[in-house]
């Protein structure tokens, strides 16, 4: 057969669907790989062909579109399962071609089972809610296109295993779940079950997402350097190890990059000809505020090193701060016989 542009297996699109539920899967060619959409391709005389490789098999085979009740069908650039079965798991390929053009991509589809409490191997999207921030909503995800707007589905929301009713701060409102005020105790998995009729049959769509309550922008502050500070002096003798911790608190900020770094005499440690190691540890609060500690270490400090300027810097979307450590050379205690005796005129 003639050459075909093969985009390979698109593992970025690790599609997971629940067993015994409808699934609609768009051919990824038009979403990620080609610069034109399905309508343009179709009007140019290109045909979209689907086939698949079963799990643990190498053989590519056509998809059977003649199953009872049209269990698997294709509509434009969408492959439909009404509903899925466990053995639909495999790698699916969509190929766009005519006599002179060919392009194809494969993607993995995994049909997963869930238990009565909606637990499953499904990777869950995470929705972040700001703590004590006023009304915030989550929306039942990925249900568009399953039924026409004329159909009015029923939606039931669950937290974990439990139907949400009479919760004091969480209210189901159709496709939305409203949090009147979010607390840490609202962390957890929330599931919407959408039930709709189609051609005399009833289908269910189950969508679970993880809610994580995070620090509110109302409480966000620029980075706070707790150490070094004015109360601690790093006094060392040459040959001793110098350890200076830089401990910085960062408020949670959506999509902010938190940075901590040291400068020695105004330069990055890598640019200074001394043997410096820097170890970093990070801890998070219950609302994803972050505390970063970078420990600057010089194994055997010299008197030159003890004269240098050591500054800890921190930056987030809220601002940049810096703090110098107070480093001194320890003055040796006087030895009586020599130094003090000299003071009394001894020679």
């Amino acid at each position: 057969s003639e050459r075909c542009d093969d985009w390979g297996l698109d593992t970025m699109r690790q599609i997971q669907v629940f067993e015994d539920e409808p699934a609609r899967i768009k051919c990824p060619l038009f979403e990620h790989f080609l610069k034109f959409n399905y309508s343009t391709a179709h009007s140019a005389g290109l045909t979209l062909i689907w086939y698949w490789t079963r799990q643990d098999r190498d053989l590519e085979e056509p998809i059977n579109f003649r199953l009872p009740e049209n269990r698997i069908s294709k509509e434009k650039d969408v492959l439909w399962f009404r509903p899925t079965l466990l053995n639909d798991t495999g790698n699916y390929t969509c190929m766009l071609r005519n006599t002179t053009y060919c392009s194809k991509v494969a993607f993995p589809l995994e049909v997963v089972q869930k238990d009565s409490c909606f637990n499953s191997p499904m990777k869950l999207p995470v929705h972040k809610l700001y703590i004590e921030y006023g009304i915030q909503r989550i929306t039942c995800p990925n249900v568009d296109g399953y039924f026409p707007s004329s159909v009015k589905p029923t939606i039931t929301w669950y937290m974990g295993c439990y139907k949400i009713q009479n919760f004091n701060n969480v209210i189901p409102e159709g496709m939305n779940l409203s949090f009147l005020i979010a607390f840490i105790s609202n962390n957890g998995n929330y599931t919407c079950v959408v039930t709709y009729p189609e051609n005399g049959r009833t289908f269910h769509l189950t969508r679970t997402l993880t809610v994580k309550v995070v620090g509110s922008p109302k409480n966000a502050v620029p980075p706070v350097i707790h150490s070094p500070n004015d109360h601690v002096v790093y006094e060392k003798e040459p040959g001793e190890e110098l350890l200076i911790p830089c401990t910085v608190y960062f408020s949670f900020l959506m999509d902010s990059r938190n940075e901590v770094w040291w400068t020695i005499d105004g330069k990055k440690p890598d640019d200074i000809p001394i043997d410096v190691t820097i170890n970093e540890s990070i801890s998070h609060s219950r609302t994803e505020d972050e505390t970063r500690t970078q420990i600057l270490s010089i194994k055997k400090v010299t008197s030159e090193d003890l004269k240098r300027s050591y500054v800890c810097h921190a930056r987030s979307a809220k601002g940049e701060v810096a703090k110098a450590a107070t480093v001194k050379q320890k003055v040796p205690a006087p030895r009586y016989t020599v130094e003090l005796a000299c003071g009394f005129g001894a020679t």
Partner: antibody, heavy 119, light 108 residues
Amino acid sequence: QVQLLQSGAEVKKPGSSVKVSCRASGGTFSIYAIDWVRQAPGQGLEWMGGIIPISGTENSAQNFQDRITITADKSTNTAYMELSSLRSEDTAVYYCARNGATSDAFDIWGQGTMVTVSS
Amino acid sequence: EIVLTQSPGTLSLSPGERATLSCRASLSVSSNYLAWFQQRPGQAPRLLIYGVSRRATGIPDRFSGSGSGTDFTLTISRLEPEDFAVYYCQQYGSSPLTFGGGTKVEIK
């Protein structure tokens, strides 16, 4: 009005375990967190850990992690704290406290359960 | 772990006087999640203030909280006889949740 009712005082031998219960009455139980705090005689308060009954999410302080088990029975609105390998330093009043109703602070406390560890 | 240091350890005052209790954190308190509790002898602690400055239900307005970051204060504007007790601060924003060592407010 929500109340937290704890089980009665216990006397235990070193090396044994104790299981303290905390029953909620007069309100929704499972959607709030229940935490456990202890207080040794004449000492301050020490957080041990907590659970959100509805999701089963449990976490505990590092120094108790290998000895503490926190569970909840939603059908009876009861939370439990079991502490194993008891030693004399575990002699304390153990409190359960609810949070997550109007804030994440401990707004309602049980009356406390005295646990004495003595040979 | 965030260490909370309360001062003074003991405060000797007369009824009607103003009490100022301090709580200092070793690191910034996340989401302003700092609370104050009152504990009378033989009783369970009682929530006074949460979120640094918000009074809990039923707490008289002579109790007020303030501060941010690492320094927090509980103020009792006019001490009543029933206010003589031990007061604890607590941060509940970072795990492990931690309490201060307590300040005893006693009658002078």
